[in-house]
């Protein structure tokens, strides 16, 4: 139960006080008691409940006509059952007794009022009155947790605008309102109550730039909503009529959790006594609601795909046809960014990561725009953000970034349990250097901080700086599986490729050619690849780098060897000893449910079939997956990327609600 104020009573004159329903009000009967009195009794109107405790140990008793010793150990508290119809209509009489004096009476006239700030603290999608039931001032995680949730209103419901909805002080329409969380102020007071009292709604100065509150006028159009709290306004005096009244507020978050903002916002209503014009207003009562800003959540490959994105560039029509066919099979919408909009930047995966935000009443896809800002720079803002599609970005928008700030270097695992700790939304994975040096690359700290601050997908730092491009999607992927943990981790494996090629040579296929059928590309015999000492040394180094990540992933995702599939792949070390795929990198695949779009490796053809394709199919088809090999050689591979790098996917949000987890 909420804490009310302390009321001091005195026999000299009647005391007038306000008691808010649902609060516990302390009654000080001692400090002004007549000197010779040693005991007291209390009588109250039927609407007032008086509790007297004499402790320690406390003996609690509701009032009757019994007398109590007048000493500091006696605690008297009041609660009110009903709101007053008129000012001071509830009475409490205290009678003081002494051995030699007649009883002395002190009168207290109480006005019971109902004032409660309600939000969806039970996370049901509906606002229910919570008076005297739960403490709204705390926010707790887990299935038994409580606390309201706010969405960053980061979509653009107004197609005429170039800004996010949270960047203006207006409510566009009911669509815009649905992105906000409802908070209701319920009051029930005597008619004349607000001639001497005022209600003020306020937010801490440290939080005022993170939230905006609109007041709705009931029965009017939503456009009648007016801003009452926000970056310029930490407090607002409310014009409340007496009697029974409900006032609706719509609350939007303006910022995602980050290093300097844990994501909690407290909105408070204060009841002020303004009866004495000579004196400052006095606080009578406060009620608060704590909201947590919904985190941005990534979706792993195991979530069903809903929309595929790719770029149209010079001569990639065949690639797009393959992706289109795959999207149709997976029943996905397909969005192609035309040449005139991508400015010859085909790396859709690197430009953005599509996740979502969720409150009990609303789920919203949100695109996280990377700071790489090349030709696709405008695509997330102009073509992805829109009605019910949010936008967020972090990091420097001009320079100061590295290749590791592209989002091919940002992935998320499926849900895992690690040494008893559950990660029901998976864990974020991104690449880094293994130690800082003058020329090592790392994901920009602003991006790392943002990802960590979301709390629900605790990030894991992998080692990817050994790669020329430096992205985790160059050596790992996840695919759905019907058994075990519901997925497999795929890792690029030089060892597995050498093993396969050695087996083929042993069977007399040493003359079979890698890159057969690719014009203008020097072909390589299996026997030459196997005998090339430098290439072996390079791949031995690569294997060590991938093995480092393998052990890290096993430890941080709680995986066993049987959860991992090795995909045959060779690399070569290029300038500054950075690795690139020697043939199209098959692990860099597009995963659309059970349909996989895998870079066509152009491996040695043996008995009419590419032995690399055959090997991969034999590894993945038993899991119910269908492998489509896509020719990306000249349009993507030789430009240092593959199918995954050139595509992006919006996926279905988790059915698991983020607030039910315990980070």
């Amino acid at each position: 139960m909420a804490q009310g104020t302390l009321i001091r009573v005195t026999p000299e004159q009647p005391t007038h006080a306000v008691c808010v329903l649902g609060t516990l009000t302390q009654l000080d009967i001692c400090s002004s008691a007549p000197e010779d009195c040693t005991s007291f009794s209390i009588n109250a109107s039927p609407g007032v409940v008086v509790d007297i405790a004499h402790g320690p140990p406390a003996k609690k008793k509701s009032t009757g006509s019994s007398t109590w010793p007048l000493d500091p150990g006696v605690e008297v508290t009041l609660t009110m059952k009903v709101a007053s119809g008129s000012t001071g209509d509830q009475k409490v009489q205290i009678s003081y007794y002494g051995p030699k004096t007649p009883p002395v009476k002190a009168l207290l006239y109480l006005t019971g009022v109902e004032i409660s700030l309600c939000a969806d603290i039970t996370r049901t999608g509906k606002v229910k009155p919570t008076r005297a039931v739960k403490d709204q001032r705390t926010w707790t995680w887990g299935p038994c947790g409580q606390g309201a949730i706010l969405l960053v209103n980061c979509d653009r419901d107004n197609l005429e605008s170039s800004a996010m909805d949270c960047e203006d002080d207006e409510v566009l329409d009911s669509e815009d309102l649905q992105d906000m969380s409802l908070m209701t102020l319920s009051t029930k007071t005597p008619k004349d109550f607000f001639t001497n009292h005022t209600l003020v709604l306020h937010v801490a100065r440290s939080e005022m730039d993170k939230v905006r509150v609109f007041q709705a006028t009931r029965g009017k159009l939503s456009s009648k909503c007016s801003v009452v709290l926000g970056p310029k306004w930490p407090s607002h005096y409310l014009m409340v009529p007496g009697g029974k009244h409900n006032m609706d507020f719509y609350v939007e978050a303006l910022a995602f959790p980050d290093t300097d903002f844990p994501g909690l916002i407290t909105l408070t209503i204060s009841l002020l006594d303004t009866s004495n014009l000579e004196l400052p207003e006095a606080v009578v009562f406060q009620d608060s609601v704590v909201f947590r800003v919904a985190p941005w959540i990534m979706t792993p490959n195991t979530q069903p795909p809903q929309e595929v994105y790719a770029c149209s560039i010079f001569e990639n029509e065949d690639f797009l046809k393959s992706v289109t066919t795959l999207a149709m099979k997976a029943k996905c919408k397909l969005t192609i960014c035309p040449e005139e909009e991508n400015m010859d930047d085909q790396w859709m995966q690197d430009e953005m990561e599509i996740g979502y935000i969720q409150a009990p009443h609303k789920t919203l896809p949100v695109v996280f725009d990377s700071p790489r800002n090349r030709g696709l720079k405008e695509f997330p803002i102009k073509r992805v953000m829109g009605p019910d599609f949010g936008y967020v970005t972090r990091g420097p928008q001009t320079g100061g970034i590295s290749g590791l700030d592209s989002f091919g270097n940002l992935e998320v695992s499926p849900p895992v349990t690690v040494r008893g700790k559950e990660y029901p939304l998976g864990r974020i994975l991104f690449g880094d250097s293994c130690y800082p040096s003058n020329d090592s690359r790392q994901m920009h700290q602003a991006l790392q901080d943002f990802l960590s601050a979301q709390q629900v997908q605790a990030p894991v730092k992998l080692y990817s700086d050994w790669l020329s491009v430096g992205h985790v999607d160059e050596f790992l992927s996840f695919v759905p599986a019907p058994d075990r943990k519901g997925f497999r981790l795929l890792l690029a494996s030089p060892r597995s490729c050498y093993k396969l090629f050695q087996e083929q040579q042993n069977e007399g296929h040493g003359e079979a050619l890698l890159f057969e059928g690719i014009k203008k590309k020097k072909q390589q015999k299996i026997k030459n690849i196997l005998s090339n000492k430098t290439l072996r040394e390079h791949n031995s180094f690569v294997e060590r780098c991938i093995d480092w990540n393998r052990e890290l992933l096993k430890r941080e995702l709680g995986l066993a060897e049987s959860d991992i599939i090795d995909i045959p792949q060779l690399f070569k070390l290029k300038e500054f000893s950075k690795a690139e795929a020697f043939f199209p990198n098959m692990v860099n695949m597009l995963v659309l449910g059970k349909h996989l779009g895998i870079p066509k490796p152009f491996g040695p053809v043996i008995n009419g079939r590419c032995c690399l394709e055959e090997k991969v199919c034999s590894l993945l088809e038993p899991l119910g997956l269908q492998c489509t090999f896509i020719n990306d050689f000249f349009t993507y591979h030789i430009r240092h990327g593959e199918v995954h790098c050139g595509t992006n996917v919006r996926r279905k949000p988790f059915s698991f609600k983020w607030w039910n987890m315990v980070p």
Epitope: G403, D439, N532, K572, K574, E575, F576, K578, I638
Partner: antibody
Framework: QVQLVESGGGLVKPGGSLRLSCAAS????????VSWIRQAPGKGLEWVSF????????YYADSVRGRFTISRDNAKNSVYLQMNSLRAEDTAVYYC?????????????????????WGRGTLVTVSS | QSALTQPRSVSGSPGQSVTISCTGT?????????VSWYQQHPGKAPKLIIY???ERPSGVPDRFSGSKSGNTASLTISGLQAEDEADYYC???????????FGGGTKLTVL
């Protein structure tokens, strides 16, 4: 064969900034590793910076690290050298140079470590 | 002071052979096969004449040859010609924090 033309040099006070550009013609610069090399008046060559074709990693000489930034815009067929906090000892002719990234080599050819195409250079003078 | 050491000058008569040395350490010339040589005529940009220790770009006469032994690389020009008079610079990849090093340059005079 690609041809390179540097621009953006000039006289600048110590502590000032300049942005050098290296524009390519005759071929697509995105197929080339690019380095900047400088030569102080009457002195030898000094390697300054490097950027790879994928535009994903860069390297710098100790003498310029933290002050100079190399970048490329493949759409504009250009590479840039942003030079901040310039010092008198940065006075030199700045050459843009490149090497083709040959995808056919079975193993690394070391093409990022040598420069087979050079521009004519642009003079940067840092003086008060 | 340059990281790779070259003689300040060498000379030779037309038709003769000259060798220019380039001495580094086990962290550059001795470690990598990424040694290259450049020719620079006065007022002109340098020109690549040898890469990967001994390979010649197309158009470079076979009078120019490169080799390496231990921490020292060498450029040999046989059958000297007047137009060979120029400054010559060696370069190597290095494992130091500056990944490409140049020698101080050698002035070749054709007598």
């Amino acid at each position: 064969q690609v041809q390179l033309v540097e621009s953006g040099g000039g006289l600048v006070k110590p502590g000032g900034s300049l942005r050098l550009s290296c524009a390519a013609s005759g071929s697509t610069l995105s197929d080339y590793f690019v380095s900047w090399i400088r030569q102080a008046p009457g002195k030898g060559l000094e390697w300054v910076s490097f950027i790879n074709t994928a535009n994903t990693f860069t390297y710098y000489a100790d003498s310029v690290r933290g002050r100079f930034t190399i970048s490329r815009d493949n759409a504009k067929n250009s590479v840039y050298l942003q030079m901040n906090s310039l010092r008198a000892e940065d006075t030199a002719v700045y050459y843009c140079s490149s090497a083709n990234d040959d995808v056919d080599d079975i193993v690394a050819p070391g093409r990022g470590y040598y420069m087979d195409v050079w521009g004519r250079g642009t003079l940067v003078t840092v003086s008060s | 002071q340059s990281a790779l050491t070259q003689p300040r000058s060498v000379s030779g008569s037309p038709g003769q052979s000259v060798t220019i040395s380039c001495t580094g350490t086990s962290g550059d010339v001795g470690r990598y096969s990424h040694v290259s040589w450049y020719q620079q005529h006065p007022g002109k940009a340098p020109k690549l004449i040898i890469y990967n220790v001994y390979e010649r770009p197309s158009g470079v006469p076979d009078r120019f040859s490169g080799s390496k032994s231990g921490n020292t690389a060498s450029l040999t020009i046989s059958g000297l010609q007047a137009e060979d008079e120029a400054d010559y610079y060696c370069s190597s990849h290095s494992r130091s924090s500056t990944p490409v090093l140049f020698g101080g340059g050698t002035k070749l005079t054709v007598l």
